[in-house]
Structures are given as structure tokens and as C-alpha cells.
């Protein structure tokens, strides 16, 4: 008996071939001997089966002695043995219909779990193997689970169902709802305008929800809410914003915040949360602000940074085109009695400059100039 695997919702074509390469009378029946369809004269005729409105044949093939049974919009319960009667012969085809669905929505928040459930006909014992977009393989029986979804899990999951040495492939598009970056650091000199961007790693037609940016300044004992906003069909509207600092927010995606001035008291870490409509849980992105200030007070040239810096970052003070006078893995460096000239304060990571501030030191009889 020939075995054919089908996918729920798809169309399957069961073949039946006569030895004579011409149109002759044929009938398709199910295992209960109920007629599904056949031909009478040149007409396609249908029987009283449940498939009536979903069964068809391909008349253009009858001339060649081929009498297919086409079943559209397959259901699991269409799994059965189908019998083609032609030329006093009976051809049997066993159809097994499988369905593979994601537990809930196919749009899941980062960190959530994905469960794929296999619908299969009674008496079948299929095995399932799924391959994620990042090439991770998972195997299982009726259910497959992946916990802690990551951004790289977004995309097409390819699942193969094996039964009777035959296989059928399902493709499920999964969208992991997350920000493009889990964390970002902005390095700014004191007084500069700060731009925070929170690009999403997915696109959906309608995006609705609400969000908030909580900020923990390095100098502050507790965090505070800097801004709250609503998102409606990708349009951003500010609900509430603090007076200090007075953040500005872009009206369109990606989410964009502007801090008019980088000041030491703002240096610190923020957490932007976005709660999406009809989703449990929130999207998070951490943002860090590092602020640099270079000053000269009497005979002391000082460079300081505020905010979350890693211990391996190097802070240096050097006269332009000269070797660094001072270089330390600390958040403040200084030079006593600095020579006149253009001094550079550099924050670097393995030789790569992250932040630079220049200060001009004048001969001792004048006052310093900060460009």
C-alpha cells in the first residue's frame, strides 16, 4: 500500500493510473467504501463523502490514463485509506495528514518559550525534527519546546515529520520581539547633546504599546522615571517627562530620545521597557551614559569620567603629539603644573579611543580656555 503524507491546510494529489492511456471510468472511494468522486461519461461526479466540496480531479490527465484525487484544505481527519477503482483493479493509497502549530502566537518576546505541537492521525507514530534559523536542531514527539528564545531564533523554523520512511516538511515563521541590542553605551563630553536610539529587531504592521525609561544616575541613591510614552500604530506620543532632564522623544520609530546636554549628574544607566499590546512581558534595553569633563583649576589639570565604565578602560591626559603624561585605569586623572598647549583627555579601550576632550592650557599668566 502506497503511503502519502499531507500537511493540514494544504492540497494533496493522490495518483491512480490505468494501463490504457485513455479516459476510462474510474472511482475513488474511502475505506468505508463511500464514493468520493469518479467520472460518468465526461462529467466529474461526486459521492456523499465528507470530502464532497474539497475533492477534485484533473480532467486534463484523464486522457493519459491518469485519474488523480485532489483533496484541498486537508484536515487531520482526512487521514484514511483511499481506493481507486479502474479497469477492474483497485489501487490503495494511505493518506496521513499532519499539522504543526506554534503553541500561542508566532510573535514571542525574547526570553519566552516556544512550543511546537504536532497534530497527527490516530495510529501514527511520527518523529519530528526542527531546525532553528541559527542552525540549532531539536527533536521530539508530539511536542517540541525551546525555552529562552533569543533574537537569533527569529526567522523560519524548518520542521521535518517522519513517518513510514516518508517525510513532510513544515516551515513556521517565528518572530522574536526584541530590541536590536540588549545594551548600548553612549560616550559624551560634558555639554554635548545626547542621542539615545532603541531600534527594534522586528517589523510588524501595527505596533501598539507603552514604554518607560527609568534612569539610575551614578550620583543618585535611587532610580527615577525620566519619561513615559505610548505607542499607537508606530506613532509615539509622550505621556509624562521629568523637568530635569527635559528629554525629547521622536514621534516615529525607531524609538529615539534626545538629552539636550550631557552633564555629570546624568551619567549612569537606564532601562527602557516596552510593553506591547496583547503580549505578556516586556521588552528591555539597557542604555548607559558616560560623561567626560576636562578642567583646569589653578595649577591642576583634571580629567574625569562619570557613568558605568569597565575596569579595563584607560583614562589618559596627554599634550598634543606627545606621549601620555598620565594614563590610569581610573575615573579621574590629573597633571600638576601642566605645560602650555593643547591637552587631550582620552578614554580608550585597548587602544581604541571612545571619548576625547581637548583643553587648552595657556602660559601661567593667563586664564585657561576650554574649546
Amino acid at each position: 500500500k502506497k503511503v502519502v503524507l499531507g500537511k493540514k491546510g494544504d492540497t494533496v494529489e493522490l495518483t491512480c493510473t490505468a494501463s490504457q492511456k485513455k479516459s476510462i471510468q474510474f472511482h475513488w472511494k474511502n475505506s468505508n467504501q463511500i464514493k468520493i468522486l469518479g467520472n460518468q461519461g465526461s462529467f466529474l461526479t461526486k459521492g456523499p463523502s465528507k470530502l464532497n466540496d474539497r475533492a477534485d480531479s484533473r480532467r486534463s490527465l484523464w486522457d493519459q490514463g491518469n485519474f488523480p484525487l485532489i483533496i484541498k484544505n486537508l484536515k487531520i481527519e482526512d487521514s484514511d485509506t483511499y481506493i481507486c477503482e479502474v479497469e477492474d483493479q483497485k489501487e490503495e493509497v494511505q493518506l496521513l495528514v499532519f499539522g504543526l502549530t506554534a503553541n500561542s502566537d508566532t510573535h514571542l518576546l525574547q526570553g519566552q518559550s516556544l512550543t511546537l505541537t504536532l497534530e497527527s492521525p490516530p495510529g501514527s507514530s511520527p518523529s519530528v525534527q526542527c531546525r532553528s534559523p541559527r542552525g540549532k536542531n531539536i527533536q521530539g514527539g508530539k511536542t517540541l519546546s525551546v525555552s529562552q528564545l533569543e533574537l537569533q531564533d527569529s526567522g523560519t523554523w524548518t520542521c521535518t515529520v517522519l513517518q513510514n520512511q516518508k517525510k513532510v516538511e513544515f516551515k513556521i515563521d517565528i518572530v522574536v520581539l526584541a530590541f536590536q541590542k540588549a545594551s548600548s553605551i553612549v560616550y559624551k563630553k560634558e555639554g554635548e547633546q545626547v542621542e539615545f536610539s532603541f531600534p527594534l529587531a522586528f517589523t510588524v504592521e501595527k505596533l501598539t504599546g507603552s514604554g518607560e525609561l527609568w534612569w539610575q544616575a551614578e550620583r543618585a541613591s535611587s532610580s527615577k522615571s525620566w519619561i513615559t510614552f505610548d505607542l499607537k500604530n508606530k506613532e509615539v506620543s509622550v505621556k509624562r517627562v521629568t523637568q530635569d532632564p527635559k528629554l525629547q522623544m521622536g514621534k516615529k520609530l525607531p524609538l529615539h530620545l534626545t538629552l539636550p546636554q550631557a552633564l555629570p549628574q546624568y551619567a549612569g544607566s537606564g532601562n527602557l521597557t516596552l510593553a506591547l499590546e496583547a503580549k505578556t512581558g516586556k521588552l528591555h534595553q539597557e542604555v548607559n551614559l558616560v560623561v567626560m569633563r576636562a578642567t583646569q583649576l589653578q595649577k591642576n589639570l583634571t580629567c574625569e569620567v562619570w557613568g558605568p565604565t569597565s575596569p579595563k578602560l584607560m583614562l589618559s591626559l596627554k599634550l598634543e603629539n606627545k606621549e601620555a603624561k598620565v594614563s590610569k585605569r581610573e575615573k579621574a586623572v590629573w597633571v600638576l603644573n601642566p605645560e602650555a598647549g593643547m591637552w587631550q583627555c582620552l578614554l580608550s579601550d585597548s587602544g581604541q579611543v571612545l571619548l576625547e576632550s581637548n583643553i587648552k592650557v595657556l602660559p601661567t599668566w593667563s586664564t585657561p580656555v576650554q574649546p
Epitope: S23, Q40, G41, S42, F43, S60
Partner: antibody
Framework: EVQLLESGGGLVQPGGSLRLSCAAS????????MSWVRQAPGKGLEWVAF????????YYADSVKGRFTISRDNSKNTLYLQMNSLRAEDTAVYYC?????????????WGQGTTVTVSS | DIQMTQSPSSLSASVGDRVTITCRAS??????LAWYQQKPGKAPKLLIY???NLQSGVPSRFSGSGSGTDFTLTISSLQPEDFATYYC?????????FGGGTKVEIK
């Protein structure tokens, strides 16, 4: 002898109804699909309707769809054509025909025809 | 709908003549074609089915050929009882459609 005999024709006013019958004999009626074909005076042949052997599948010409109904009673070896909302252009000789059981069709047995005249 | 065009619409011939009637379909119908003969006041009679298959009891002087869109009915030697109107009919698609007919008259 294989035979088909139509009856029920006659004169009817536009908008009226008529039911044609076709009595089959000499063959296993319940094993064959059947059709109705008509011929207007001095004109060619026009296929009207088809019914499968079990009466489940029916096809109609666009010109009669929604007005004519083909049916059969296999226990009485009889084919019917219920004609409603008749129009002048339905005036014709109506033939019942047996569909050849070969896979290519063709109507291999025909009745002698019954005349339907639609006129006021 | 598939249109069936027959030619000629009428012809005059003598007993013993070879007569050819053609039928053209507006689209390919493979071999889904039948030919009928109809005499005045009588029901049509099936002559050929599947373009070239002779119906049981029909004299062998009748033959059919063709496939796709062009078909031919040939009467190899016309007999007195063959004077009638001939129709082609496609059964590839519903609605079934007939050609306009070819009337074969005595010359």
C-alpha cells in the same frame, strides 16, 4: 430493447412551470448518468442539464441555472426536469439522453423528444 | 464556454461520394469530441466518441479523426440513408457545447 420515453411537454405561458419526465427501460437505469438536451425550432442542439447515476452531482447550462432542476428516481427508472419561470426562448423539443459510460462521454441513447412551447 | 465551429454549414453530395466535415474548438479539448447524426423529426444518434471511436452498430464508412482543436468526420462512401444533419459536441468542459450542424443534402 433500450428505450427512453419523454412526456410532460405542452403549451405554457411565460413565467409558468412544467415538469418533464423520461421513463427508462431495457437497461440498469441506476448505473447511468443522464442528460437533458433541447433543440429550438429550426436550430441546433443545446445541452441543458446533467445528473449522475446516484443523483448527487448535477450540472446546468447557464441559460437555465436557477430556473430548471434535474432529478431522478432510480426506484421508478425515471428522470425529471422541473422547469420554472419559463421564457419564450425555452421553446424547444426536449430530449433526455443516456450518458455513455465510457470515460469520454457522448450520449449513446436518446428519447424521441417532447415539445415545450412557451407563448402567451 | 468552449465554442464549436462546424464547416461547411451545408453541402450537396451524391451517393458514393467521400464526404468530409470539419469541427474546430475554440480551445484544446484533447480528444473529448463526439459526432451525432440527426434526421428530420428524429432524435440525434451517436456515431463517434473520443474523436475517433466508432459507436457500436455504426457502419464502418463513418470515421473520425483529430485531436486538440481540429477534428474531422469522414463518410468514405455516402449512402442514401446518410443524408442528414451532423453535429459535433465537446465534452471537455461544462457546459457541453455542440457545433452549429452540417446539413448533407442530395445533389
Amino acid at each position: 430493447e433500450v428505450q427512453l420515453l419523454e412526456s410532460g411537454g405542452g403549451l405554457v405561458q411565460p413565467g409558468g412551470s412544467l415538469r418533464l419526465s423520461c421513463a427508462a427501460s431495457g437497461f440498469t437505469f441506476s448505473s447511468y448518468a443522464m442528460s437533458w438536451v433541447r433543440q429550438a425550432p429550426g436550430k441546433g442542439l443545446e445541452w441543458v442539464a446533467f445528473i449522475s447515476d446516484d443523483g448527487i452531482t448535477k450540472y446546468y447550462a447557464d441559460s437555465v441555472k436557477g430556473r430548471f432542476t434535474i432529478s431522478r428516481d432510480n426506484s421508478k427508472n425515471t428522470l425529471y426536469l422541473q422547469m420554472n419561470s419559463l421564457r419564450a426562448e425555452d421553446t424547444a423539443v426536449y430530449y433526455c439522453a443516456r450518458d455513455d459510460s465510457s470515460g469520454y462521454g457522448g450520449m449513446d441513447v436518446w428519447g424521441q423528444g417532447t415539445t415545450v412551447t412557451v407563448s402567451s | 464556454d468552449i465554442q464549436m465551429t462546424q464547416s461547411p454549414s451545408s453541402l450537396s453530395a451524391s451517393v458514393g461520394d467521400r464526404v468530409t466535415i470539419t469541427c474546430r474548438a475554440s480551445q484544446s479539448i484533447n480528444r473529448w469530441l463526439a459526432w451525432y447524426q440527426q434526421k428530420p423529426g428524429k432524435a440525434p444518434k451517436l456515431l463517434i466518441y473520443s474523436a475517433s471511436n466508432l459507436q457500436s452498430g455504426v457502419p464502418s464508412r463513418f470515421s473520425g479523426s483529430g485531436s486538440g482543436t481540429d477534428f474531422t468526420l469522414t463518410i468514405s462512401s455516402l449512402q442514401p440513408e446518410d443524408f442528414a444533419t451532423y453535429y459535433c459536441q465537446q465534452s471537455y468542459n461544462t457546459p457541453l457545447t455542440f457545433g452549429g450542424g452540417t446539413k448533407v443534402e442530395i445533389k
